[in-house]
Interface confidence: medium
């Protein structure tokens, strides 16, 4: 539909509340190191200028695109050249230029410090004396950390944070009702960040049909009794609405976000019969439910693949007439026959296909050259169930951190090059797989497993892009999307590595360790194991595992000393010779 | 739920044409494969044409290919099957079959329709 003017459109359709949000969101996401009250100034701005659009929507600049009205809002911060350097060169451009160029100066690793949690009577109080700045200032803090957060999701999730404090700030034990939901709402969000930055990485550099074929395989096993027709609807909505997220459209994405949701709930008798409870929810939680609801059951009776794909005469003919229509088919009959293979295996196996038809159709004989097509899916299928089988092993025994040590080692080893808190942040994720996954039945094994270490890589890929070092990264990177989990699994140790000097410093621990919770004194140990990994490449398990121990003892004795710096600085000494000793440094 | 519903049939000399209609309701016809088969007596359903839904692909059996047209037209959810230079072997009941989910696919294989109408007999004879 045309609208004289985009903005009072979109105003009227997500209503005040939610528009200043998304806006709030998009500008924290393009503009990441600026302060909050600048922020909310920009927005407060745009809000009264779309108000005067509703009232007339032939008033002056009421007609200009969004990209342009936000874009020359952005331009004004009187700051952009100090705090942004050559990202301020985006404001000589003309959209969609412009917009483009603001795009690729999103950082997803940018340098802000780490949000310290206050003391809960300090949040309650905030929470209290001003809601609505309170909330604000959440949705500014994960924004700019995560310029890629799925903004209507993020709507869902400050909903969440506002009713954690409506209900805790009450409670009599404000601290135990309030911390487990506010690190539930932190560890969720991560993941939920992670997700969809896969989806732009698949949008922004493999194109729109990697995405669709990731949304045809996706929601083939999701609905599978939903028809062909019906899943290819949804996968041009979805594609549609993530890449206006993706691409900064956010008033746009959300909007459309939700009238698919609309779209499917009107239409759940011929989507699936699990989509009633969702259904029944207001919207953002409504489209949250929708997106992860569970797998419907699969249609009894489902015919052979073989006899469409395989033994038809007209194998050839469709797929010459119409080729990504007849791959999608391909692809959807086998996500909906196999809810227990990750997408990407899917992907591999629908990629096969295609390359078999490709050279088959060209042959003398077509039938007898894809005859065996089927066959060839074999070791594709067997490769993840084979790995998966032996890193749940390897985790049953080991448990989670130790497990997150052993990947630490495999991928340092793998890629040295890359820095320490990315080797970290990555192989702790990695890590995180055995207790995401290990515990569900061999059927609900693989889509957990693979289809998370595929989100996990992405990160590696993304914060690897912004500073390579690394030929090997990059490679498996960019060659292919289904095939970044493979082609890191492949890699050998890198024989041309040279190993980095060695540096005391970086084994030097202070008292302060002591007052880490857990997850921090894990990371300090983790980040010790990389950088000995990077000394002596060629250590073996057996050397690092003493190493580590030692390092462990180390710890536990210093932090219950009297003199705690002194024995740090001491023992920590005697540590270092040792250790170098054990590893023939 | 797709009804299916044949007319058109009737006895034609040989040589001559007969335009045979299939009027769908329950779906649109364009969403689904849709095919012509026949049974002549005595004999299992034979496949005579076929098109995709979506993408409009035909199909036919090679013993009608240059003589049978099939065609659909949206608006009257209808599907059509124009059968010149008729000969005697072509006598046989006609059935117009439905596979919806499978837009592009026209199977050659009758048990791969789900939905079926009540047929209508086609007599070539002089």
């Known amino acids: 539909d045309a609208h004289k003017s985009e903005v009072a459109h979109r105003f009227k359709d997500l209503g005040e509340e939610n528009f200043k949000a998304l806006v709030l969101i998009a500008f924290a996401q393009y503009l990441q190191q600026c302060p909050f009250e600048d922020h909310v100034k920009l927005v407060n701005e745009v809000t009264e200028f779309a108000k005067t659009c509703v009232a007339d929507e032939s008033a002056e600049n009421c007609d200009k695109s969004l990209h342009t009205l936000f874009g020359d809002k952005l331009c004004t911060v009187a700051t952009l050249r100090e705090t942004y350097g050559e990202m301020a060169d985006c404001c000589a451009k003309q959209e969609p230029e412009r917009n483009e160029c603001f795009l690729q100066h999103k950082d997803d690793n940018p340098n802000l410090p780490r949000l310290v949690r206050p003391e809960v009577d300090v949040m309650c109080t905030a929470f209290h004396d001003n809601e609505e700045t309170f909330l604000k200032k959440y949705l500014y803090e994960i924004a700019r950390r995560h310029p890629y957060f799925y903004a209507p999701e993020l709507l869902f999730f400050a909903k969440r944070y506002k009713a954690a404090f409506t209900e805790c700030c009450q409670a009599a034990d404000k601290a135990a009702c309030l911390l487990p939901k506010l690190d539930e709402l932190r560890d969720e969000g991560k993941a939920s960040s992670a997700k969809q930055r896969l989806k732009c990485a698949s949008l922004q550099k493999f194109g729109e049909r990697a995405f669709k074929a990731w949304a045809v395989a996706r929601l083939s096993q999701r609905f599978p009794k939903a028809e062909f027709a019906e899943v290819s609807k949804l996968v041009t909505d979805l594609t549609k609405v993530h890449t206006e997220c993706c691409h900064g459209d956010l008033l746009e994405c959300a909007d459309d976000r939700a009238d698919l949701a609309k779209y499917i709930c009107e239409n759940q008798d011929s989507i699936s019969s699990k989509l009633k409870e969702c259904c029944e929810k207001p919207l953002l939680e409504k489209s949250h439910c929708i997106a992860e609801v569970e797998n419907d059951e699969m249609p009894a009776d489902l015919p052979s693949l073989a006899a469409d794909f395989v033994e038809s005469k007209d194998v050839c003919k469709n797929y010459a007439e119409a080729k990504d229509v007849f791959l999608g088919m391909f692809l959807y009959e086998y996500a909906r026959r196999h809810p227990d293979y990750s997408v990407v295996l899917l992907l591999r196996l629908a990629k096969t296909y295609e390359t078999t038809l490709e050279k088959c159709c060209a042959a003398a004989d077509p039938h007898e050259c894809y005859a065996k097509v089927f066959d060839e899916f074999k070791p594709l299928v067997e490769e993840p169930q084979n790995l998966i089988k032996q890193n749940c092993e390897l985790f049953e025994q080991l448990g989670e951190y130790k497990f997150q040590n052993a990947l630490l080692v495999r991928y340092t080893k793998k890629v040295p090059q890359v820095s320490t808190p990315t080797l970290v942040e990555v192989s702790r994720n990695l890590g995180k797989v055995g207790s995401k996954c290990c515990k569900h039945p061999e059927a609900k094994r693989m889509p957990c497993a693979e289809d998370y270490l595929s989100v996990v890589l992405n990160q590696l890929c993304v914060l690897h892009e912004k500073t390579p070092v690394s030929d090997r990264v990059t490679k498996c990177c960019t060659e292919s999307l289904v095939n970044r989990r493979p082609c890191f699994s492949a890699l050998e140790v890198d024989e041309t590595y040279v190993p980095k000097e060695f540096n005391a410093e970086t084994f030097t621990f202070h008292a302060d360790i002591c007052t880490l919770s857990e997850k921090e004194r894990q990371i300090k140990k983790q980040t010790a194991l990389v950088e000995l990994v990077k000394h002596k490449p060629k250590a073996t398990k057996e050397q690092l595992k003493a190493v580590m121990d030692d390092f462990a003892a180390f710890v536990e004795k210093c932090c219950k000393a009297d003199d705690k710096e002194t024995c740090f600085a001491e023992e920590g000494k005697k540590l270092v010779a040792a250790s170098q000793a054990a590893l023939g440094l | 739920e797709v009804q299916l519903l044949e007319s058109g049939g009737g006895l034609v000399q040989p040589g001559g044409s007969l335009r045979l209609s299939c009027a769908a309701s329950?779906?649109?016809?364009?969403?689904?494969?849709v095919a012509w088969f026949r049974q002549a007596p005595g004999k299992g359903r034979e496949f005579v044409a076929g098109i995709g839904g979506g993408v409009d692909i035909t199909y036919y059996a090679d013993s009608v290919k240059g003589r049978f047209t099939i065609s659909r037209d949206n608006s009257k959810n209808t599907l059509y099957l124009q059968m010149n230079s008729l000969r005697p072997e072509d006598t046989a009941v006609y059935y117009c079959?439905?596979?919806?989910?499978?837009?592009?696919?026209?199977?050659?294989?009758?048990?791969?329709?789900?939905?079926w109408g009540q047929g209508t007999l086609v007599t070539v004879s002089s």
């Open positions: 079959a439905a596979r919806p989910g499978r837009p592009l696919i026209t199977s050659q294989v009758a048990d791969l329709y789900p939905y």
């Open positions: 329950g779906r649109y016809i364009d969403e689904t494969a």
